[in-house]
Amino acid sequence: QGQDRHMIRMRQLIDIVDQLKNYVNDLVPEFLPAPEDVETNCEWSAFSCFQKAQLKSANTGNNERIINVSIKKLKRKPPSTNAGRRQKHRLTCPSCDSYEKKPPKEFLERFKSLLQKMIHQHLSSRTHGSEDSSGTTNTVAAYNLTWKSTNFKTILEWEPKPVNQVYTVQISTKSGDWKSKCFYTTDTECDLTDEIVKDVKQTYLARVFSYPAGNVESTGSAGEPLYENSPEFTPYLETNLGQPTIQSFEQVGTKVNVTVEDERTLVRRNNTFLSLRDVFGKDLIYTLYYWKSSSSGKKTAKTNTNEFLIDVDKGENYCFSVQAVIPSRTVNRKSTDSPVECMGQEKGEFRENWVNVISDLKKIEDLIQSMHIDATLYTESDVHPSCKVTAMKCFLLELQVISLESGDASIHDTVENLIILANNSLSSNGNVTESGCKECEELEEKNIKEFLQSFVHIVQMFINTS
Amino acid sequence: DCDIEGKDGKQYESVLMVSIDQLLDSMKEIGSNCLNNEFNFFKRHICDANKEGMFLFRAARKLRQFLKMNSTGDFDLHLLKVSEGTTILLNCTGQVKGRKPAALGEAQPTKSLEENKSLKEQKKLNDLCFLKRLLQEIKTCWNKILMGTKEHITCPPPMSVEHADIWVKSYSLYSRERYICNSGFKRKAGTSSLTECVLNKATNVAHWTTPSLKCIR
């Protein structure tokens, strides 16, 4: 019972820290001792340093009362636990003054990290680690640490799949402090987007710690948990350019204006998400490939905006594809080509259906943003035209998993509607039999964002051929 | 019946929650234009630790203003249920876990500035956006209070699924865990490996939801 009270209290403290983070500009900008990478068994000592710190309201505006109340709550004594009692008698923990001092924003971030760590430790102390015959706990270090990053959405992946062990990831800039993420996870990936978007021009290093599953206090033979470093990663120079999309084309006489969609990234400035163009500015260019629908001879043009104005022959239909390029880079300079868009395609009933499918997909994407659905779904990211119906059926099947796991009525309705639309359009082609195509279960499992992106691309294939 | 804790929030979940959800459901269309609306009410009244009772008391009072809107009978009925029901439940001693006396014991201003605003001005604030947000905050605040009464409820070990294993990180209420197909087996497309620790409201016993997972060779 006391343990549960302790857990509730710790969660409440996290809420209070989160609330104070909203008022960070109303706090006295004083540097306060902010423990990070706290030694094992010194968590309670570090916790008391956070509590003792002189966090103060700057006495400006209407928020003073709410800030003072929150600070008061932070300083309340938490319910005692065995671990806490044990640590209070440990004399070897660093003094509060020896910890690095940080302004309120970082102070609160570090306090939250410590609270999360303490909750995880508390949870894991209820289970038991696996031991080998000698009675010591076995863990293996992570390996093959790989950065997967597109348009700044950045995930660190590693191996192996854990057996009786869990992982915690840390990330830092070359000169910065380590920040822990994905505490005690059984996943072999960790989304570090939130960290890298703070400054995409910095160079980051991550490391993955391995702990025995039931006993995160226990460490490797040297008394330190095993860990492995990632390669260095500079988002601005290395994030892959996502596949661009042609937003529109408009013909006036012998000129055609082709517009490329300005992809939104997860990089924020002043609380708004920046587009790819906002982030890269003139460093980003687009190459347009265009050709007469009736021939294969391609022409090309470039722009450092998102628009092309090209000359065409009157009475001819053209097809277009674009590629994003960052000329100043030496690797990862180019995106894959956008789906092909052609002039003069009849917007028949089924094409209209597919267009509606895309807007339903966008709606689903918006709705799930606030939910934590960590499902991975079978995704065909490189659909061969001769297998597009088979691939589409897999996408529709897997879409139902999103509906199931969200438990959200409007997602459920949107998915249902989308499946009806897609099936109507598919049945309009008669019963197409495609051979030599992959079974759904043979496809790679991807996260929901990538799944939905690939889904949009296959729908565009249907639009282009309907 | 005031014994919400004993029945684990049954009164709230079978009466108030139903009405709140009905109201929110009927306001589904509202929202896209409300994204940037800032309402002073929520800056001044927050469902904060040890202030839940006060927040709900004020929010319930605020709801009454919306009864005068010429909406359908059903809508008004649900609003009345939420407003009156919240007030009644708050008056149940001990309901807001020792917080109520302190919260309601505070001196009450005769009328808050917010309430003095004319309905015309309220219109400017965008009635429906405010109402929707108010209902969402009330729901969240009640959930926060009642979460406390459910914290200690845990699930038994989850059921077994053919050709799959599960490693449970947490047995507590609302935990979400995943089964993993055994080596040589793959999740059948369209099936979900997720299971969730949920509460059976009738028996007040927690159980894991049945995953739709099928593991195939």
Epitope: T300, V325, N332, K334 | -
Partner: antibody, heavy 117, light 107 residues
């Protein structure tokens, strides 16, 4: 360091074909297009076309369609240009060059193709 | 197709002189223009890209200016090794045409 090394000069009879190679080193081959440029004796530079090793797309000048065929072998980081139905006016120095999108920053040393009966 | 008209076709100057070559595009090409130098029997060498940017390792006496349809290339103080043929090239849209060249000779 970055280098583009072209195959040696060739003497061909009219009507024959010739394949000129351009081996790239010192950079990520698929990240840059390879351009081909012709310079006839005593004349200026003429753009033939380019190939994008990343996606295999080729773009040709109208004057060289059917005359030049551009290909790449990604495994050896080599670009090729095949010239068919050679005539005496195809006698020239042929250059390959690396495209950095805004210009051609590294050039091969040039391959002289002589067409003579 | 975009035509590039380079002038003059040839030019005599002395060491230390300031010389300017112009290049005119038949339609707007924004700043998608490059300048190259070529010596007899050698490959062309990049001097200026994106109309105004100096390529790596190129001396600062070389400069480029202009955008849209009118471009110029300047050598502020001629050095003996600068006597060669200079080409402009538009890299805006295919075919990526070159100017006909300007031969810079010693007076």
């Amino acid at each position: 360091q970055i280098q583009l090394v072209q195959s040696g000069g060739e003497v061909k009879k009219p009507g024959a074909s010739v394949r000129v190679s351009c081996k790239a080193s010192g950079y990520s081959f698929t990240d840059y297009n390879v351009y081909w440029v012709r310079q006839s004796p005593g004349k200026g530079l003429e753009w033939i076309g380019y190939i994008d090793p990343y996606n295999g797309i080729t773009i040709y000048d109208q004057n060289f369609k059917g005359k030049a065929t551009l290909t790449v072998d990604k495994s050896t980081s080599t670009a090729y240009m095949e010239l068919s139905s050679l005539r005496s006016e195809d006698t020239a120095v042929y250059f390959c060059a690396r495209d950095v999108t805004t210009a051609l920053d590294f050039w091969g040393q040039g391959t002289t193709v002589t067409v003579s009966s | 197709d975009i035509q590039m008209t380079q002038s003059p076709a040839s030019l005599s100057a002395s060491v230390g002189d300031r010389v300017t070559i112009t290049c005119l595009a038949s339609q707007t090409i924004d700043t998608w223009l490059a300048w190259y130098l070529q010596k007899p029997g050698k490959s062309p060498q990049l001097l200026i890209y994106a109309a105004t940017n100096l390529a790596d390792g190129v001396p600062s006496r070389f400069s480029g200016s202009g955008s849209g349809t009118d471009f110029s290339f300047t050598i502020s103080s001629l050095q003996p090794e600068d006597f060669a043929t200079y080409y402009c090239q538009q890299v805006y849209s295919s075919p990526f045409t070159f100017g006909q060249g300007t031969k810079l000779e010693i007076k």
